[in-house]
Each structure stands twice: as structure tokens, then as C-alpha cells.
């Protein structure tokens, strides 16, 4: 009945509603139908959120923070529905809401506890700092404080640095991991326990490839079945690291099935893409193509990073000319 938030029933006419920052929620309240309905929603027993009586809203003394953000289900009031539709919740809206309903036959009071969570999609980044390589799991805005765990080759790592910046409403978190010289696979999980939402980033380094100039290279990129759900929107980006920064070669959007290619020598196999295989070919290699190639498959729930190191060597022909 209430699709915009989920709630947990607890004793004493009290319910817990969990909403997401900037989304709309419903604070539920029901009563035994009757005439002369009076509805008063209050926050923390002090601030007027919404009042309805004598068949219409009375918002003259509504607290300004709720202006244009609340409404009732007017066609449902006569059926015993006093629920409050609440627009664009913020973290400041967290707390206890009391719904007072009076009718010609009774008065009831319901309490609803609103908890608000934030979970802007995290990212996993691969960075080179001088001679060091780092994986960074970061989330720009999250609340409450998340649980971050790292695994190396599926084994939990105790080392877990967390750089945290707290703003008025949420946390910004970076968790860097030094992976210099490692060929292991790494996994980072960020969990928001309130929203029951988990995001996973996975990093895999493939064996280095040695190619001759003018040859072509095929680089594999296939999602791990554990994470990948084809009916969920995702984006695939292939990029190449040059002098410490990545430049995008091509990307694919699952929602529109669009492929954008920025490098004329790059090719993607449409049939393979339809089978969720995002391996790519780079034709006519030259020496400057040496470097690291990164395939990034990302959705709201995961990021899968695959790194290939390509070494392009001069062909015999070129070498003999020199």
C-alpha cells in the first residue's frame, strides 16, 4: 500500500519508516472510520507538520520547514486513512512524528519514527601516485556511517584506512588501499545498514600482454556472474592510462544499448556485447599504445574493474631500420 518507503512494525502504536534523502515517503496512520475527522501531525511533539479538520487543511500555523511538503490522502480519509505524504525528506526530518486523529467516536494517537538514509552510488578508482598504485573505494554522500570491508583474493583484510569528511547531513568517505606490485584481486564492500543497501567494487589484474608493433590486441572484460544482473542498468567504459591519467577509448550504456567510440582503432564485437562480453580489440598497435587498459563495468550496486598491461615492442622490421 505504501510503496515509497519501507516500515517495520513495533509495539505501542509505533512504526519505523525508513526513507531516502530527497525522496518522498509516506508516514502511515490509520483509524476506525468515523465522522468529524480531525488530523494533526506533529514532529517531536512540538512542531506542527499538518492539520486537517472540518473537511480541509489548516496550515496557518504549520512549521515553515514543512511548507509545500506535506499532504494527506484526501479521498481516503473517510476510509480511515490518515497517512501523511511527505515530499523530499532531509536528514533534519529524522525523528518521531505523532499523528492525532479525532472523530465523533474516538481519539487515537499513532507514533511514527522516521529514519533517513543516504547512499549516493559509491565508486572504485584505480590511481597511480608516483610509483605506487592505489585502489580507492569512495562514497560522496552516505548516512549513517557505512561499514567498509576489503578482501584480497576473497580473504578479508584487516588494514582499512578510512578518510571521512562529515557535513551537516552526511558523510563523504574514501577508503584507499595500496596495491603496489600486487597481482591479487581485490574487493571492497560498502554497506548502508539502515537502507539495507550494499555496493561492491571488484578489481582484477590480468597477465601482461606483449605485442609487436602493427599487430592487434584483444583484451577481455567479462562481468562476474555473482554481481552482474543483465536487467539492471549499467555502463561499460574502456580507458587507457597515459602519464598517470586515464583517457576514455569507448563506452557502452546498457539502457540505450549505445556504444560511443573515441579511438578509431578500437573495436567492439556487437554479438559479444549481447552476450555480456565486453572484450575489445585494438588494431594496428604502435609503441605509444603501451600502458594500462582499464575496463570499468558499473551499476548502482557494483563496479568491476579489470586491468590489462600491454607492452608494445618494435617489430623486427622497425628494429632493423634503426
Amino acid at each position: 500500500i505504501f510503496p515509497l518507503a519501507f516500515f517495520i512494525y513495533v509495539p505501542m502504536n509505533e512504526q519505523i519508516v525508513i526513507g531516502r534523502l530527497d525522496e518522498d515517503i509516506i508516514l502511515p496512520s490509520s483509524f476506525e472510520r468515523g465522522s468529524e475527522v480531525v488530523i494533526h501531525w506533529k514532529y517531536q511533539d512540538s512542531y506542527k507538520v499538518h492539520s486537517y479538520y472540518k473537511g480541509s487543511d489548516h496550515l496557518e500555523s504549520q512549521d515553515p520547514r514543512y511548507a509545500n511538503r506535506t499532504s494527506l490522502f484526501y479521498n481516503e480519509i473517510q476510509n480511515g486513512n490518515a497517512s501523511l505524504f511527505f515530499r523530499r525528506v532531509s536528514l533534519l526530518d529524522e525523528g518521531i512524528y505523532t499523528c492525532y486523529v479525532g472523530t465523533a467516536i474516538q481519539v487515537i494517537t499513532n507514533k511514527v519514527v522516521l529514519k533517513v538514509g543516504v547512499f549516493l552510488t559509491p565508486v572504485m578508482k584505480y590511481e597511480k601516485r608516483n610509483t605506487n598504485s592505489f585502489l580507492i573505494c569512495s562514497v560522496l554522500s552516505v548516512y549513517p556511517r557505512p561499514i567498509i570491508t576489503w578482501k584480497m583474493d576473497n580473504t578479508p583484510i584487516s588494514e582499512n584506512n578510512m578518510e571521512e569528511t562529515g557535513s551537516l547531513d552526511s558523510f563523504s568517505i574514501n577508503s584507499p588501499l595500496n596495491i603496489t606490485g600486487s597481482n591479487s584481486s581485490y574487493e571492497c564492500t560498502i554497506e548502508n545498514s539502515l537502507l539495507k543497501q550494499t555496493w561492491t567494487g571488484r578489481w582484477t589484474m590480468k597477465d601482461g600482454l606483449h605485442k609487436m608493433q602493427s599487430e592487434h590486441v584483444s583484451l577481455s572484460c567479462q562481468p562476474v556472474n555473482d554481481y552482474f544482473s543483465p536487467n539492471q542498468d549499467f555502463k561499460v567504459t574502456w580507458s587507457r592510462m597515459k602519464s598517470g591519467t586515464f583517457s576514455v577509448l569507448a563506452y557502452y550504456l546498457s539502457s540505450s544499448q549505445n556504444t560511443i567510440i573515441n579511438e578509431s582503432r578500437f573495436s567492439w564485437n556487437k554479438e559479444l556485447i549481447n552476450q555480456s562480453d565486453f572484450s575489445m580489440n585494438l588494431m594496428d598497435l604502435n609503441l605509444s599504445d603501451s600502458g594500462e587498459y582499464l575496463c570499468n563495468i558499473s551499476s548502482d550496486e557494483y563496479t568491476l574493474l579489470t586491468i590489462h598491461t600491454v607492452h608494445v615492442e618494435p617489430s623486427q622490421e622497425t628494429a632493423s631500420h634503426n
Epitope: 465522522s35 468529524e36 480531525v38 494533526h40 506533529k42 511533539d45 506542527k48 492539520s51 479538520y53 472540518k54 473537511g55 489548516h58 500555523s61 492525532y100 479525532g102 472523530t103 465523533a104 481519539v107 494517537t109
Partner: antibody, heavy 121, light 107 residues
């Protein structure tokens, strides 16, 4: 059963003050708005003031605004009317009356027996 | 303030008669009108709310009608116990106001 019992009436000189009380029982006091209504001897009824169930809203008739103050103590199930700067025309039987619900409806389902206030020099 | 005017001011009728009291508001009050009965030396008693809803425990010979500015209270068959003064009251807006009352006498 619902009971409202007023007290505190008496004879007072013009310009003086008086405090009326109303003791409530037989219902959950903190769920209901309470009004004061008065009736001058041999005359009709006049609404005086209301306080909502939680004390958040108070409204007064023009004839008493600024002189009378309505208040309630939900922990003691009592309602009060502080009457200052009394005038001869304030002479009346004062009733406390329970609203249908929060105080927002504005009609009177249960009444006390009244207490007489006489303002006279 | 909204003025409420009742008519007649006094009314004399016999037991068993059908009695009608009218109440006029100086501006529209929708259906936000109540009727009270007050017996001598007693507090008023609620009879009708929202113009036509009978309060619990009130005999069914009492009924109310009207909306906007014109309202009536009807006693379908007058009983000796109905000797009282009847008041209408608007609760559309603060300040709440009463009619001046209709005194009903039994012939």
C-alpha cells in the same frame, strides 16, 4: 463517565483578577480541547476561549482577548482561566466544555455545571 | 464575527406538536452548526452537530437540517420534557457564536 467540575467563582471588584479552574475526569484529558463558555444572568451563551489538546493553540473571543488567559496542565487533568482587569459585563456563569476532539472542531459535547463570577463594586 | 439570528424568540406549543426553530447565519457557515438544549438552572446539552447529525443518546424526535446560512431544528412530536431554551451555534470560524436562543414553552 465524563465529568467537568468548575471552581473559583465568586464576587470580585472591577479591575481585579480571578482564576477559574476546571477539573476533568472520566476521559483522557490530554486527547481533548477544552473551551470556556459563559452566560450572563438571564442572557444567552457566549463562547470565551479554547485551548487545544496539547496546549499548542489558544483562541479567545474579542471581548476578553488580552485580559483572559486559558491554560491547562495535562498531568493534573486541570484547565484554568486567568481573568484580569475584570469588568461588570464579565459577570456570568462560566462553564468549561469539552470539544468533540482536539479543540479544532469548536462545538461542545460535554459541559460542567458552571461557576458564577460576579463583578461588582 | 458571524452573527446568528434565531426565530422565534419564544414559542408555545402543545404536547405532540411538530415544532420548528430556525437559525440564520450572517454569512455562509457550510454545515458547521450545532444545536443545544438548556433546561432552567442546568448546563446546555448538545443535540445536533454538523447541522443534521444527531448526537449519541439524543431522542430521534430531534432533527436538524440546512446548510449555508439557513438552518432548522425540528421536534417531530413535542414532549413535556422538551421544555427548555434552544440555542444554535456556528463553529465555522473563530470566534464561535451562538444565536440569542428560543424559549420553548408547553401550552
Amino acid at each position: 463517565q465524563v465529568q467537568l467540575v468548575e471552581s473559583g467563582g465568586g464576587v470580585v471588584q472591577p479591575g481585579r483578577s480571578l482564576r477559574l479552574s476546571c477539573a476533568a475526569s472520566g476521559f483522557t484529558f490530554s486527547d481533548y480541547g477544552i473551551h470556556w463558555v459563559r452566560q450572563a444572568p438571564g442572557k444567552g451563551l457566549e463562547w470565551v476561549a479554547v485551548i487545544w489538546y496539547d496546549g499548542s493553540d489558544k483562541y479567545y473571543a474579542d471581548s476578553v482577548r488580552g485580559r483572559f488567559t486559558i491554560s491547562r496542565d495535562n498531568s493534573k487533568n486541570t484547565l484554568s482561566l486567568q481573568m484580569n482587569s475584570l469588568r461588570v459585563e464579565d459577570t456570568a456563569v462560566y462553564y468549561c466544555a469539552r470539544d468533540r476532539s482536539s479543540g479544532a472542531m469548536g462545538y461542545f459535547v460535554y459541559w460542567g455545571q458552571g461557576t458564577l463570577v460576579t463583578v461588582s463594586s | 464575527d458571524i452573527q446568528m439570528t434565531q426565530s422565534p424568540s419564544t414559542l408555545s406549543a402543545s404536547v405532540g406538536d411538530r415544532v420548528t426553530i430556525t437559525c440564520r447565519a450572517s454569512q455562509s457557515i457550510s454545515s458547521w452548526l450545532a444545536w443545544y438544549q438548556q433546561k432552567p438552572g442546568k448546563a446546555p446539552k448538545l443535540l445536533i452537530y454538523k447541522a443534521s447529525s444527531l448526537e449519541s443518546g439524543v431522542p430521534s424526535r430531534f432533527s436538524g437540517s440546512g446548510s449555508g446560512t439557513e438552518f432548522t431544528l425540528t421536534i417531530s412530536s413535542l414532549q413535556p420534557d422538551d421544555l427548555a431554551t434552544y440555542y444554535c451555534q456556528q463553529y465555522n470560524a473563530y470566534s464561535y457564536t451562538f444565536g440569542q436562543g428560543t424559549k420553548l414553552e408547553i401550552k
